[in-house]
Interface confidence: medium
Amino acid sequence: NKILVKQSPLLVVDSNEVSLSCRYSYNLLAKEFRASLYKGVNSDVEVCVGNGNFTYQPQFRSNAEFNCDGDFDNETVTFRLWNLHVNHTDIYFCKIEFMYPPPYLDNERSNGTIIHIKEKHLCHTQSSPKL
């Protein structure tokens, strides 16, 4: 049986950080799992990955281009990304793999989450020129 994942369809980011939650139709207190976050329509870039285990919190590591951390509970993995820039605006996909014990399981591809990072504009109040 494939595992289903629910993601928010859109996250608009004003600051430079975001938390993306991946909710799975499976209990994460499995024995060994690998939770990852991918960027792009074709999931070309592995942004962040955490190897989890029933007995210890997963260690999350990020792609050189990103800063990430994460956390999980029974059915949700939350990825936290920071130092984001406008060019990080893209669609992001959650993935979970249960590595052991057999059988290997992973999730059905979700619709993803579009993370839209807003450009920061420094607003200067313009005084109207005197005539």
Epitope: F54, E97, Y100, P101
Partner: antibody, heavy 118, light 113 residues
Framework: QVQLQQSGAELARPGASVKLSCKAS????????MQWIKKRPGQGLEWIGA????????RYTQKFKGKATLTADKSSTTAYMQLSSLASEDSAVYFC???????????WGQGTLVTVSA | DIVMTQSPSSLTVTAGEKVTLSCKSS????????????LTWYQQKPGQPPQLLIY???TRESGVPDRFTGSGSGTDFTLTISSVQAEDLAVYYC?????????FGAGTKLELK
């Protein structure tokens, strides 16, 4: 480095029970499955079952349900297998092994010889 | 349960010879999720525990000589030893890691002429 040290040879009477041990070191004992395997002379390898020391979860092959009981002691990082109602066909070498990467049997103990004889 | 069938049961070889061992499973060991075949090969020498040679049907374990090659997919698998050495004389087992219960083939015994 990962080491699995098994207890010494056992000589037992038919109908008796034996408890074999497998002392683990060099890794986090609670985070990996411990497997048990039977090897009779001139025959192949048989998987008996596995235990996850983190929570005591066990899996057995049908043939060994009721014959083998797997337990684990976290404090001593030791896995145990008790074999009950011993018969001559239980005479074999028994191995413990730990899963590794994508293989169930990556690290092995040296084996314990069990001889059942009247 | 998945049944693993190995052939031949024994093989007499000459040093330097190329050897091919066969393993067939009663159902596919290919996992569609990650496109990996959950088939593992082990080598067991007399008086020793088995040693992991190849996992995922074709991935050689570190430290295993490159004369050992695993291939195949689905239900048919092969272990090839390109040039047999005296130290390769052992029993070779294939094993399904696809699902519980885990099952082994009966083994192929490699003997020297």
């Amino acid at each position: 480095q990962v080491q699995l040290q098994q207890s010494g040879a056992e000589l037992a009477r038919p109908g008796a029970s034996v408890k074999l041990s497998c002392k683990a070191s060099g890794y986090t004992f609670t985070s990996y499955w411990m497997q048990w395997i039977k090897k009779r002379p001139g025959q192949g390898l048989e998987w008996i079952g596995a235990i996850y020391p983190g929570d005591g979860d066990t899996r057995y092959t049908q043939k060994f349900k009721g014959k083998a009981t797997l337990t684990a002691d976290k404090s001593s990082t030791t896995a145990y297998m008790q074999l009950s109602s011993l018969a001559s066909e239980d005479s074999a070498v028994y191995f413990c092994a730990r899963n590794y990467r994508y293989s169930s049997f990556g690290y092995w103990g040296q084996g314990t010889l069990v001889t059942v004889s009247a | 349960d998945i049944v693993m069938t190995q052939s031949p049961s024994s093989l007499t070889v000459t040093a330097g010879e190329k050897v091919t061992l066969s393993c067939k499973s009663s159902q596919s060991l290919l996992n569609s999720g990650n496109q990996k075949n959950y088939l593992t090969w082990y080598q067991q020498k007399p008086g020793q525990p088995p040693q992991l040679l190849i996992y995922w049907a074709s991935t050689r374990e570190s430290g295993v000589p490159d004369r050992f090659t695993g291939s195949g997919s689905g239900t048919d698998f092969t272990l090839t030893i390109s040039s047999v050495q005296a130290e390769d004389l052992a029993v070779y087992y294939c094993q399904s890691d696809y699902s519980y219960p885990l099952t082994f083939g009966a083994g192929t015994k490699l003997e020297l002429k």
